[in-house]
């Protein structure tokens, strides 16, 4: 059946994707999470840059900073303390690593109008936070943290030993921010405030990478990072707390770690406080499959914290690692002992167990061949959750409500059929007591931000829709996309495959394959996104295909932790199998494949260009890890143990990049990476290509001088075209 | 094989202070709590306190608060404990223990007699 | 403090007979307790660990049960080496409490 006249029309007036509507992010979308403040109000920055207070019961909103007063110190970012007496306005902001900065803090008094004048605060500022209660300001700067009991005050120094590069207070050393507790920060206020705990960490015996950051000057300067490679020895953590109201009357009281813990090398993962006197700790062994949850209660007559057997929870994997990616953390009830948390069942899938005195006698509180990913609040009636149960969609996230104060306890999905074609991909945030809550909707269909009310879960208004996005893209011929499985070997490989807009089964296209495939990631979800590889299905005809092999996430155990000690072997295997099936379909020309990846991606495309399986033509990788060993002790040793002879080194070194230099003869292989990749070194592309050289085996590179693991600014724009480039001349495409 | 080897005897004077030393190999020092326990004639066992070697962190019981400091020499795997301020009731044997999570005390020095007598 | 309570604080008894011993705590202490033996002159020597484990080179005659506040030591037939002082440990806490002992002697 044809369309009528007036819709090819249209279609002719409808134009494909160009590189440059990427590079310029003409179809970015935005979402909307509110600032909550109270149970019924939420701070939300205006598009003209005011600060708006907005109530959602009385419906009222009004400006409680200007815009006027952000621009006077420039401020990029504010944060209203809990008495709404001040505000601090950041500026300056400098960014460090993947979440860190410092920035230049100022304090603006709400009740007068002006900016506190007196013992302002020092720059720049690694860290500051208001109390949970009240307006103490708990700051770090150069390591050592310091606590005001009111702003205008004089500050408190906390802790001494501070140095740079050796040890930290309050916040994280390289590998603890990228690897462990993914924040900039390691300290955390009681919730009202009584009591501050944080973390030392002592990096004094750890080897640093040293790169140059060749600048401007007539000399590069180095920089040196203490960066724990796999085996390496490890940074040495405290943890500390301090009474914030008698800072000076007992000093900082050390929280001792677990004897069965102590024994060998550790980690500290996260810290949750429970009570103002209560505090839940949480360990994890150097071999990443014993966790203790530790919960510590302050002792008056003692002055300190005492963290009793009987409150220590083990949490052990016998088929893998502890956890996911990272050790969930407890989401505790309100008799302040019982908690709920994420871990697997005895089938192997991640689930929500409730914990009230031991890990043995955990109730099960959801089941079945999916996974719980997410606990966002629990209150004295309800626990809200994240899932991919609906529909067997691992890729979908939906949120639920599991009643608790019934039983049995009564389960309902808030999102399910909310807009059904549209959202398929939710996170949430919640008020005070979930009185109200947002909805983000990431795709299939272009985002919106909603806002619900807690109790009845009715939606009271829409926060944001994208609408501009949504008329910029009517006359946008966009990819069609699909999401599908392949059962392969008792193995399901679910796929998103992304189509030119005239697709035709009957014709033969380029297949470039898009991969990560990292342990416990996934690529396959149902996400709206305009981006590079859109454009290539658009304007430049390419199928795509995204395909979660084993040790992705959210399936269950058996995938997630087939690559336990094996990096590099299964997850180049599946995209090989999948490429095969497409192959299959019948529409994939097999002289023209092709496969990128970014980090973990790069390390799995160039593994597969060098399978010597003769699938792929061409392939790209971005700033790849090339050897285990090259990799930071947190990451790699979880999924790999260490590479000592009566370990797991023999993997180390059969699972390099460097070992198959040979097998990229008769492939076409660009090969990139910044100078000044903090994360994944330089070292590991430096490493693959002096061992093609030396193999001399033929092969395309790009530096990107003083640029670190994300290419940004004007490199993104350079990469992007010079990927393109190189991809449209492997597939003998016109430019 | 585990073994704790402590200081010899000690005679002091009220008012003084002694340090007594605890020797520890056959295993990781720096990955076990090192308790130390009195006892004086007569009488039953009194827990002190303890010192985590690899941190050097300390917990004391109250009735040695203020009186007692326990270090470590990770170096020569060897733990101390100082009580200071001595009167004749803390003359006793003291002995240093190693923690072993499931076990609690399971290795000893062969204890040290502190006498304080003018 | 958790409070060790041991009763009774001298059991007379011959050799063959049954010995029992009880530990009361002051509040719940889980399975964190240990028992040892001390004989006049000698360090004291670890004989039952976690309530109930038995360690290893301790005759099995030896054998401790309970959790939570009550615990028992029982040794099923007295034996001539058996006459000396027991002493219960909590461990559950950091801040460890002994009993203050019983002395098994020969009737």
């Known amino acids: 059946l044809r369309p009528p006249r007036v819709h090819n029309s249209e279609e002719n007036t409808m134009r494909a994707l160009t590189l440059k509507d990427i590079l310029n992010g003409t179809f970015s979308y935005k979402t909307f999470f509110p600032n909550w403040i109270s149970g019924q109000e939420y701070l939300h920055q205006s598009a003209d840059n005011n600060i708006v207070l907005y109530n959602i019961e009385t419906g009222q909103s009004y400006t409680i900073l200007s815009n006027r007063t952000m621009k006077s110190v420039n401020a990029s970012n504010y944060g209203l303390s809990p008495d709404r007496q001040f505000v601090y306005l950041e500026s300056d902001y400098s960014k460090l690593w993947r979440y860190s900065y410092t920035a230049t803090y100022y304090i603006y008094d709400l009740s007068n109008g002006e900016f506190v004048r007196g013992n302002e605060l020092p720059r720049p500022i690694q860290y500051l936070c208001w109390s949970p209660v009240g307006s103490k300001l708990a700051y770090v700067y150069q390591n050592n943290i310091y606590l005001k009991q009111r702003p205008g005050d004089p500050p408190f120094q906390i802790t001494f030993n501070g140095r740079e590069n050796k040890i930290f207070n309050g916040i994280p050393d390289w590998v603890y921010e990228e690897e462990m507790l993914a924040t900039k920060y390691a300290l955390w206020w009681s919730p009202n405030g009584k009591f501050l705990a944080y973390a030392e960490f002592n990096d004094t015996d750890i080897p640093v990478i040293a790169y140059s950051y060749y600048g401007d000057e007539q000399y590069p300067r180095t920089i040196n990072i203490p960066y724990p490679k796999a085996g390496a020895k490890n940074p040495f953590v405290r943890i500390f707390i301090i009474d914030t109201t008698y800072p000076a009357y007992v000093g900082p009281q050390e929280v001792p770690v677990p004897a069965m813990i102590a024994s060998s090398d550790y980690y500290f993962s996260w810290l949750t406080w429970v009570t103002d006197e209560r505090v839940c700790l949480q360990w994890l062994k150097r071999v990443q499959n014993v966790s203790v949850l530790s919960i510590c209660d302050f002792r008056e007559d003692w002055q300190t914290w005492d963290c009793p057997k009987t409150q220590e929870h083990i949490e052990e994997s016998r088929t893998g690692w502890a956890g996911g990616f990272f050790v969930s953390t407890p989401v505790f009830s309100y008799d302040a002992i019982s908690y709920y948390k994420i871990f697997s069942d005895k089938d192997g899938y991640k689930h929500i167990h409730y914990i009230k005195d031991t890990v043995e006698n955990a109730i099960q509180i959801t089941s079945g061949k999916w996974e719980a990913i997410n606990i966002f609040r629990v209150t004295q009636d309800s626990l809200f959750y994240s899932s991919n149960e609906f529909e067997d969609y691992p890729g979908r996230r939906n949120i639920y409500r599991i009643s608790i104060g019934s039983y049995p306890p009564s389960k309902k999905c808030v999102t399910c059929h909310l807009r059904k074609e549209r959202c398929q991909y939710y996170t949430a945030s919640f008020s005070d007591y979930a009185k109200y809550y947002a909805l983000v909707c990431y795709g299939p269909g272009i985002p919106i931000s909603t806002l619900h009310d807690g109790r009845t879960d009715q939606e009271i208004k829409i926060l944001e829709e994208n609408k501009e996005l949504e008329n910029a893209l009517k006359n946008i011929q966009l990819p069609k996309e699909e999401i599908k499985k392949l059962e392969v070997d008792e193995i399901t490989l679910w796929y998103k495959m992304i189509l030119p807009p005239q697709f035709d089964r009957s014709k033969k296209y380029p297949l470039l394959i898009q991969v990560y495939g990292g342990p416990c990631s996934q690529s396959v979800r149902s996400v709206f996104a305009v981006n590079w590889i859109s454009y290539l299905a658009s304007k430049e005809g390419m199928v795509i295909a995204l395909v979660d092999g084993r040790g992705t996430a959210f399936q269950g155990d058996k995938l997630l932790y087939a690559v336990y000690r094996k990096l590099g072997v299964y997850e180049v295997e599946d995209q090989i199998t999948a490429v095969r099936k497409f192959i299959e379909m019948g529409f994939i020309d097999e002289k023209r494949i092709a496969i990128w990846g970014w980090s973990y991606g790069g390390y799995v495309s160039s593994l597969a260009l060098a399978s010597g399986t003769g699938l792929f033509k061409c392939g790209i990788a971005v700033a790849p890890v090339s050897s285990w060993e090259y990799y930071a002790s947190v990451y790699t040793e979880r999924f790999m143990g260490l590479p000592t002879k009566d370990d797991n080194l023999e993997h180390y070194k059969n699972s390099t990049v460097m070992a198959r230099a040979e097998y990229f003869r008769n492939v076409d292989y660009l090969l990139i990476h910044g100078t000044a990749d903090d994360n994944v070194h330089f070292q590991n592309s430096a490493q693959i290509a002096k061992a093609l050289v030396n193999a001399q085996v033929d092969f395309q590179a790009m530096w990107y001088s003083d640029q670190n693991h994300g290419l940004s600014g004007l490199s993104t724009n350079h990469l992007y075209t010079h990927m393109t480039h190189f991809l449209k001349q492997c597939f003998s495409l016109s430019d | 094989q585990v073994q704790l080897v402590q200081s010899g005897a000690e005679v002091k004077k009220p008012g003084a202070s002694v340090k007594v030393s605890c020797k520890a190999s056959?295993?990781?020092?720096?990955?076990?709590?090192m308790h130390w326990v009195r006892q004086a004639p007569g009488q039953g066992l009194e827990w002190m306190g303890w010192?985590?070697?690899?941190?050097?962190?300390?917990n004391y019981a109250q009735n040695f608060q203020g009186r007692v400091t326990m270090t470590r020499d990770t170096s020569i795997s060897t733990a101390y404990m100082e009580l200071s301020s001595l009167r004749s009731d803390d003359t006793a044997v003291y002995y240093c223990?190693?923690?072993?999570?499931?076990?609690?005390?399971?290795?000893w020095g062969q204890g040290t007699l502190v006498t304080v007598s003018s | 403090d958790i409070q060790m309570t041991q009763s009774p604080s001298t059991l007379s008894a011959s050799v063959g007979d049954r010995g029992t011993i009880t530990c009361r705590a002051s509040q719940s202490i889980g399975s964190w307790l240990a028992w040892y033996q001390q004989k006049p002159g000698k360090t004291p020597k670890l004989l039952i660990y976690k309530a109930s484990s038995l360690e290893s080179g301790v005759p099995s005659r030896f054998s401790g049960s309970g959790s939570g506040t009550e615990f028992t030591l029982t040794i099923s037939s007295l034996q001539p080496d058996d006459f000396a002082t027991y002493y219960c440990q909590q461990y559950n806490s950091y801040f460890r409490t002994f009993g203050q002992g019983t002395k098994v002697e020969i009737k």
């Open positions: 056959g295993y990781t020092f720096t990955g076990y709590y």
């Open positions: 223990a190693r923690d072993d999570y499931n076990k609690n005390l399971d290795y």
């Open positions: 010192i985590y070697p690899n941190t050097g962190g300390t």
